[in-house]
């Protein structure tokens, strides 16, 4: 159906009818939720200052490193091995390197008077040859320091290696020395200049504040704002052995922290500094353990090109400056107290499964019946009727059947396929409870009505004879006052049902159905109640008093509008309804579904 | 770690054939060269045969043509099948691994023992009429 759209439509609204439950248990548990969400929700607020709106920051780093070493180098001069004494300055053992690292050397191999010539290889598995058949000429290979010639040639003693063209002679393959050449590296201070800016907040700060002691080294409880560190306690804070990782080398990140609180009322922008190891101090040997480079130091001697090649070993210090700004903004505030909204709603989830779980079918047939602490859970059952509605789908098939000597209500929803309704089971529904507001409006018509018989002789000659005359009850008749359908095959076994389940009186025998049903009285009442002007020929009068009296005995003995629209009434009483107004010619058409 | 266990030695005629086999244990051993070499008595330690960790092989100029090297990866095994067998192999023959894992030996230095790390304890080969 298309959707037509008038001004009316748009100018509504539409809102929720809800059940308000008078109870001290589910008032304490909704209570209890609100009260926890509610301080859960303010304290998010207040600790992680969701009020606020949130700048990383920017930062750039510089760093001064000062220190002396004295080193003690062993070398071999002329065969014979002396210990010489070098003092390295900061120009010594530090290098010039990009974005925010710094590099100390804590050790190093020399190898000294190197010049491109033709030499043996170092021997090593890959360089150790006993025939030229192992050396290939103009091969390269990664772990090699030069070109083969390809000729395997005697590098001391018996010892032969693979020539190559390369810087002469080669680099041996050895340990780094032990302890550190600058193991005194230890004592050297770094200064970290360090300035931030939250461009978003227009605010800049930098970790050095005019009056700071410049004297001062820094110490995580005593000093922790010092900006000056010592390298032997960097390593103190990370649990390593400077004099360790300096045998290697090794990688030292420098943490700074902004966590810059840029309201007026609460201003604190400082920086908290922590130290964390970044290399894997577990690897093995194959994969190249610590930190080391080469570079060389180039000269000419005797016009020859020459230089000393070293491989320093040493730390790499990283400093990653990360962190945030955060200054009072309305709009995340709303934002927050927005998202928050919806976890209110977690009580009436809860209160919600409670009530549905303890009124469920397995709660009433399993855990009531023995459970004698469960049993006040039982009013759970009254709260889930009056917060739900249950509906059934109106399919052509469903039918309400209401037996009077019988408590509750059978839906058949189910083709009968040839069987009488009488003997089809069924599902069992509780009778609605009998909302006596609507009797209380027919006073007048209940107090002394008129006797059915005496009724207007026009109606009386009217009365041909429509109903069968038969007084032999059906087979499924139990009142006695059935008479067998006037319907089709198909559709006789709709009608064949008694107001009995088992022997007894009919229905019709009581003098609530004289009253209620078939009292002209009452029904022309309950039509004019409907319609005041309703003036109707004697045909059409009786057809509509029919009906009404329909209506009534569904209403009377269904309680429930909806299981009203689908009653199907027994055939004594539709018999009975139907001598008392009757249909001048024709068939009667029997029960059609409303939907 | 390998080890490695050579099996399949024996006295055999000349011109007869005789199949060795080299057993390692090791779950990486598809990363290694495996070579076979022979010592006779009194004489330098002589390559007879190589398969890299990729297949590729060589031989010695002595048996090229008598003697193939194989590798089989799901059984950790490297067979040395003789052929046409001559008086002058008769050695004690021994099965060896060289690591590939940081980088492959370069096939003109398959023939090389520097290379190799790891070494089994050898069997005997007798060719004798």
């Known amino acids: 159906m298309p959707a037509c759209c008038s001004c009316s439509d748009v100018f509504q609204y539409e809102t929720n009818k809800v059940t308000r439950i008078q109870s001290m248990n589910y008032g304490t548990i909704k209570w209890f939720f609100h009260v926890i969400i509610f301080s859960y929700v303010c304290f998010a607020l207040v600790s992680d200052k969701l009020y606020q709106r949130k700048e990383p920051v920017i930062s750039s780093v510089h760093t001064k490193v000062k220190g002396i070493a004295e080193v003690k180098e062993e070398i071999v001069e002329n065969g014979v091995k002396k210990l010489v004494h070098s003092v390295f300055d900061t120009a010594d053992y530090t290098f010039p390197l990009q974005g925010n690292s710094f590099f100390v050397m804590t050790n190093f191999l020399k190898t000294e008077g190197q010049e491109q010539r033709l030499c043996p290889e170092y021997p090593t598995r890959r360089t150790l040859c006993s025939s030229d058949r192992g050396c290939k000429k103009g091969w390269m290979d990664p772990q090699s320091k030069g070109i083969q010639t390809g000729r395997c040639v005697v590098y001391e003693g018996n010892q032969k290696t693979c020539e190559v063209s390369a810087w002469c002679p080669i680099e041996a393959v050895e340990e780094a020395p032990r302890p550190a050449l600058l193991n005194s590296a230890e004592n050297f201070t770094v200064l970290i200049k360090n300035n931030i800016d939250f461009p978003g907040h227009n605010y800049t700060t930098r970790n050095i504040l005019p009056g700071l002691n410049i004297t001062c080294t820094f110490h995580k409880t005593q000093n922790p704002q010092c900006p000056i560190f010592r390298l032997g306690d960097i390593f103190r804070e990370t649990g390593d052995n400077f004099s360790d990782v300096a045998i290697q080398g090794g990688i030292m990140g420098i943490e700074i922290y902004w966590d810059c609180n840029l309201d007026r009322w609460f201003h604190h922008c400082r920086p908290k500094y922590s130290f964390r190891r970044l290399d894997d101090k577990t690897t093995n040997v194959s994969l190249y353990p610590g930190y080391n480079f080469r570079y060389a130091k180039y000269y000419k001697e005797n016009n020859v090109e020459k230089r000393t090649l070293i491989k320093v070993f040493g730390i790499r210090f990283d400093i990653l400056v990360f962190g945030t700004g955060g200054k009072f903004d309305i709009i995340q505030l709303v934002v927050y107290i927005g998202s928050t909204l919806s976890y209110f709603g977690l009580a009436a989830v809860f209160i919600d499964f409670l009530i549905d779980t303890y009124s469920s079918n397995c709660c009433r047939s399993h855990i009531y019946p023995w459970c004698k602490c469960c049993q006040p859970c039982v009013v759970n059952e009254y709260y889930y009727r009056k917060k739900c509605e249950s509906i059934v789908e109106p399919k052509p098939t469903l039918k309400y059947v209401s037996f009077v000597d019988e408590s509750h209500i059978r839906m058949v929803n189910q083709q009968l396929l040839g069987r009488s309704l009488q003997d089809v089971k069924g599902q069992e529904v509780p009778r609605p409870a009998m909302d006596f507001t609507d009797l209380s409006r027919l006073p007048l018509a209940l107090h002394d009505t008129p006797p059915i018989p005496g009724q207007p002789e026009e109606i009386q000659l009217l009365r041909k004879e429509a109903t069968p005359r038969s007084r032999d009850s059906p087979v499924w008749c139990q009142c006695g006052s059935c008479l067998p359908s006037q319907l089709p095959e198909s559709h006789r076994c709709l009608e064949e049902l008694c107001c009995r389940k088992k022997p007894g009186a009919c229905i019709t025998t009581s003098e609530l159905f004289r009253k209620l049903v078939l009292s002209r009285h009452v029904l022309q009442f309950l039509l004019l109640y409907q319609e005041p002007l309703l003036a109707l020929d004697v045909d059409s009068t009786n057809s509509r008093l029919r009906h009404c009296a329909y209506r009534c005995y569904a209403t009377w003995r269904f309680g429930s509008q909806d299981m009203a629209d689908f009653a199907i009434l027994p055939s004594c009483c539709r018999w009975r309804i139907r001598k008392e107004f009757p249909k001048s010619e024709g068939q009667y058409s029997g029960f059609k579904s409303p939907y | 770690d390998v080890q490695l266990v050579e099996s399949g030695g024996g006295l055999v005629q000349p011109g007869g054939s005789l199949r060795l086999s080299c057993a390692a244990s090791?779950?990486?051993?598809?990363?290694?060269?495996m070579g076979w070499f022979r010592q006779a008595p009194g004489k330098e330690r002589e390559f007879v045969a190589a398969?890299?960790?990729?297949?590729?092989?060589d031989y010695g100029d002595s048996v090229k043509g008598r003697f193939t090297i194989s590798r089989d990866n799901s059984k950790n095994t490297v067979p040395l099948q003789m052929n046409s067998l001559r008086p002058e192999d008769t050695a004690v023959y021994y099965c060896?691994?060289?690591?590939?894992?940081?980088?492959?030996?370069?096939?003109?230095?398959?023939?090389?023992?520097?290379?190799?790390?790891?070494w089994g304890q050898g069997t005997l080969v007798t060719v004798s009429s």
């Open positions: 090791g779950r990486t051993f598809r990363h290694y060269a």
């Open positions: 060896a691994a060289a690591d590939e894992t940081l980088g492959a030996v370069p096939n003109f230095r398959l023939h090389e023992k520097y290379e190799y790390e790891y």
């Open positions: 398969i890299s960790s990729y297949g590729s092989t």
